[in-house]
C-alpha cells in the first residue's frame, strides 16, 4: 500500500491520528520537507538573540544578535560580545591590543602590524591599535643613492601616533 504521507507537502505533517491526513504544522513549528510525520519546534530568538525572520510553516526562524554582540557559528548559533576597534575579546573581557598589533573591527583578534621591511619598503604611516601600518616606497626609492640597508622608520607607540 502506498504511503499516503509522501503526499504531505512541506508545512504539514502526516497525522496518524486522522488516517494519515496532512495536517498543517501548528503555530511555532515547521516542516521544511514533505512527507514528515512531525513538525519541528521553531527556534526562539530570545536573550542576546533577536528575530531576523519569523518561523514559517516551512522554514525555521532566523536569528541575529542584539546590539553589542555579533553572530558566531552556522545560522548564528552563538552571540559573542563586540569589543571596540583596537581591542580583542579574551576570557576576561575586552582587552587592548598589545603594542605591535591591531584590530580594525569589533570582533576577531589583534593581528601583527605588517613588517614593511620584508617587502623592502619603509613605514609611511605608523600603526596604531586600530590600524595597520601603511608601507611606502622602499628607502632606496625615497633617496636615490642611499644605502639599501637603511632601516625603515621605527613604529611608535599607538598612543603617541600623530592624529
Amino acid at each position: 500500500l502506498q504511503d499516503l504521507c509522501s503526499n504531505c507537502p512541506a508545512g504539514t505533517f502526516c497525522d496518524n491520528n486522522r488516517s494519515q491526513i496532512c495536517s498543517p504544522c501548528p503555530p511555532n513549528s515547521f516542516s521544511s520537507a514533505g512527507g514528515q510525520r512531525t513538525c519541528d519546534i521553531c527556534r526562539q530568538c530570545k536573550g542576546v538573540f533577536k528575530t531576523r525572520k519569523e518561523c514559517s510553516s516551512t522554514s525555521n526562524a532566523e536569528c541575529d544578535c542584539i546590539s553589542g554582540y555579533h553572530c558566531l557559528g552556522a545560522e548564528c548559533s552563538m552571540c559573542e560580545q563586540d569589543c571596540k576597534q583596537g581591542q580583542e575579546l579574551t576570557k576576561k573581557g575586552c582587552k587592548d591590543c598589545c603594542f605591535g598589533t591591531f584590530n580594525d573591527q569589533k570582533r576577531g583578534i589583534c593581528r601583527p602590524w605588517t613588517n614593511c621591511s620584508l617587502d623592502g619598503k619603509s613605514v609611511l604611516v605608523n600603526g596604531t591599535k586600530e590600524r595597520d601600518v601603511v608601507c611606502g616606497p622602499s628607502p632606496a626609492d625615497l633617496s636615490p643613492g642611499a644605502s639599501s640597508a637603511t632601516p625603515p622608520a621605527p613604529a611608535r607607540e599607538p598612543g603617541h601616533s600623530p592624529q
Epitope: G11, S31, K50, T51, E54, D64
Partner: antibody, heavy 115, light 112 residues
C-alpha cells in the same frame, strides 16, 4: 491593548507623508508591527512590517518608496512620491503569536492624494 | 509574486446554512495562510492563521483547512452577524527582504 493610526490627510501628488501608529498596553519590540492599506471600495493590500528584532520587510511594489521605522511606543510609515493610486485607508496592526499575521488592528487613517 | 485566487466573489446563504470559500495560491505556501473577516467601515478581524488555527475569541463555527496551494474556509450555522467580506492571505518570503503577504480578492457573504 490598542493600536491607533494618525497623520492621514489630503496631499498633492509627489508630497511625502509620514503616518504614525501609536500603541498602548503592549511593547512594540515584542511583536511584528504591520502596515496594510485599502483603497476605497477595494480589497486589502499588504505594505510591509517591522519585526520584533527591528528588521523590516516590504511588498515588492512598496520597497524603496515606503519606509517603516519604530520607537518604543510608535511605528512610522514614511511614504514618498505619492500618487493618486496611493489614496487609501492605511491600517496599522500587531502580529499574532510571533508572526506577521495581523490580529490587533487600528481603525485606520485616510490618505487622499489629489491634485 | 505569489497570487492568491479567491472564489467565489460573492455567495448568499440563509441563516443556519453553511458557506465554503476557497483560496488557491499560485505556488506552494505550506500552511502559511490566514483568513480575515471585514465589515463595512471597520478594520479586518483575524479568524484563522496557519491554515487551521482559530484566532483568540473566534467562534468554532469558522473552520480552516488545506495546505500547499488549496485552502478552504467553512462557516457553519450561519448567523446574520457573519455577513461580511472575507479575505485569505498568505505569508511567503522572497529574496532581498521582499515579502509576498498577498491577500485574495475577497468574498462577500450575504446572509438571507
Amino acid at each position: 491593548q490598542s493600536v491607533e493610526e494618525s497623520g492621514g490627510r489630503l496631499v498633492t501628488p509627489g508630497t511625502p507623508l509620514t503616518l504614525t501608529c501609536t500603541v498602548s498596553g503592549f511593547t512594540i519590540n515584542s511583536y511584528h508591527m504591520i502596515w496594510v492599506r485599502q483603497a476605497p471600495g477595494e480589497g486589502l493590500e499588504y505594505i510591509g512590517f517591522i519585526n520584533d528584532g527591528g528588521f523590516t520587510y516590504y511588498a515588492s511594489w512598496a520597497k524603496g518608496r515606503f519606509i517603516i521605522s519604530r520607537t518604543s511606543t510608535t511605528v512610522d510609515l514614511k511614504m514618498t512620491s505619492l500618487t493618486v493610486a496611493d489614496t487609501a485607508t492605511y491600517f496599522c496592526a500587531r502580529g499574532v503569536d510571533g508572526t506577521s499575521y495581523p490580529d490587533l488592528w487600528g481603525p485606520g487613517t485616510l490618505v487622499t492624494v489629489s491634485s | 509574486d505569489v497570487v492568491m485566487t479567491q472564489t467565489p466573489a460573492s455567495v448568499s446563504e440563509p441563516v443556519g446554512g453553511a458557506v465554503t470559500i476557497k483560496c488557491q495560491a499560485s505556488q506552494s505556501i505550506g500552511s502559511d495562510l490566514a483568513w480575515y473577516q471585514q465589515k463595512p467601515g471597520q478594520p479586518p478581524k483575524l479568524l484563522i492563521y496557519r491554515a487551521s488555527t482559530l484566532a483568540s475569541g473566534v467562534s468554532s463555527r469558522f473552520k480552516g483547512s488545506g495546505s500547499g496551494t488549496e485552502f478552504t474556509l467553512t462557516i457553519s450555522d450561519l448567523e446574520c452577524a457573519d455577513a461580511a467580506t472575507y479575505y485569505c492571505q498568505c505569508i511567503y518570503y522572497g529574496s532581498d527582504d521582499v515579502i509576498y503577504h498577498t491577500f485574495g480578492g475577497g468574498t462577500e457573504v450575504v446572509v438571507k
